[in-house]
Amino acid sequence: LNTTVLQGMAGQSLRVSCTYDALKHWGRRKAWCRQLGEEGPCQRVVSTHGVWLLAFLKKRNGSTVIADDTLAGTVTITLKNLQAGDAGLYQCQSLRGREAEVLQKVLVEVLEDPLDDQDAGDLWVPEESSSFEGAQVEHSTSRNQETSFPPTS
């Protein structure tokens, strides 16, 4: 799996969208975890609702929010009030029992607000990160997400 690099501004929200095959992962909960070192374990940050049919509901742990559109096959993670300490390697995961399958690896980079930089000359506006492997970034507060209710069978 390639790693998607996403950049966000400190103090703002970063939204990550991990896409997956909705049929392949039907019934599976999703999770967002932080990789501890290159070969280390991935520490769970937040996972979707325990009841798969309610996966569209936002679930929060601290400043991280997750929600899964199981019909579209998109799990969205929002890192609110991004801090320098949030930088690092993460994974979107699909869960089956005690097993976790990596859907996507995401490297989060936190950019300092140039307005807070005493040495800043010209105002620098970061480029939008390129969108590939189904991941994208927004340099703004996340919008509300309307999601259809998943099928019951």
Epitope: K24, G50, W52
Partner: antibody, heavy 118, light 113 residues
């Protein structure tokens, strides 16, 4: 009607290669996991591995990793179980089974009996 | 690997009576996050392929009569067949799928007295 139709019985000699098949019909073959299960004569069931034909994502039981190859051709809705060098201990009935993404198996093929004897 | 142990090995039953088959796992099959217990039951009738009876501890598969019920928690599980009929004969297997490799119990052969 969902059906999994397996290839016929095989009699082989040790060291020979073999590929058996499982053809799915009555459903979207690419969109369901498909497992292989072994049953040695007079014994119980053993899970060998599973494949998702949509992208050929394959998982093996450690007991069968390197011993067999699981593959699928979604264009003809067929999954395969393959050996490069058979042993007498491979003599068994082999079942394919359609699985959900949570890995329980709702439809089974009729089985393929493989006999390996010199 | 998770080891699944079934008892008894053989179970002679009288039609109309209730049969109970036990299955024990070497590790808990309960996922504490979603509350599901990843334990299924299959029946292999004589000369036939296996068929799914019960999945995720207690959910009956499509077309399975309500005479079949699954229960248990953690590591100890039971399949109950009430009002046993002649067509219920065969070998019953429990299977865990909380982690790979998926593993089956050794089977319990149910026969009519």
């Amino acid at each position: 009607e969902v059906q999994l139709v397996q290839s016929g019985s095989e009699v082989k000699k040790p060291g020979e290669s073999l590929r058996i098949s499982c053809k799915g019909s009555g459903y979207s073959f690419s969109s369901y996991w498909l497992a292989w299960v072994r049953q040695m004569p007079g014994k119980g069931l053993e899970w060998m591995g599973i494949i998702y034909p949509g992208d050929s994502d394959t998982r093996y039981s450690p007991s069968f990793q390197g011993q067999v190859t699981i593959s699928a051709d979604k264009s003809i809705s067929t999954a395969y179980l393959q050996w490069s060098s058979l042993k007498a201990s491979d003599t068994a009935m082999y079942y394919c089974a359609r699985g959900t993404p949570l890995f329980y198996f709702t439809y089974w093929g009729q089985g393929t009996l493989v006999t390996v004897s010199s | 690997d998770i080891v699944m142990t079934q008892t008894p090995l053989s179970l002679p039953v009288t039609p109309g009576e209730t049969a109970s088959i036990s299955c024990r796992s070497s590790q808990s099959l309960l996922d504490s996050e979603d509350g599901n217990t990843y334990l299924d039951w299959y029946l292999q009738k004589p000369g036939q392929s296996p068929q799914l009876l019960i999945y995720t501890l207690s959910y009956r598969a499509s077309g399975v009569p309500d005479r079949f019920s699954g229960s248990g928690s953690g590591t100890d599980f039971t399949l109950k067949i009430s009002r046993v009929e002649a067509e219920d004969v065969g070998v019953y297997y429990c299977m865990q799928r909380i982690e790979s490799p998926l593993t089956f119990g050794g089977g319990t052969k149910v026969e009519i007295k």
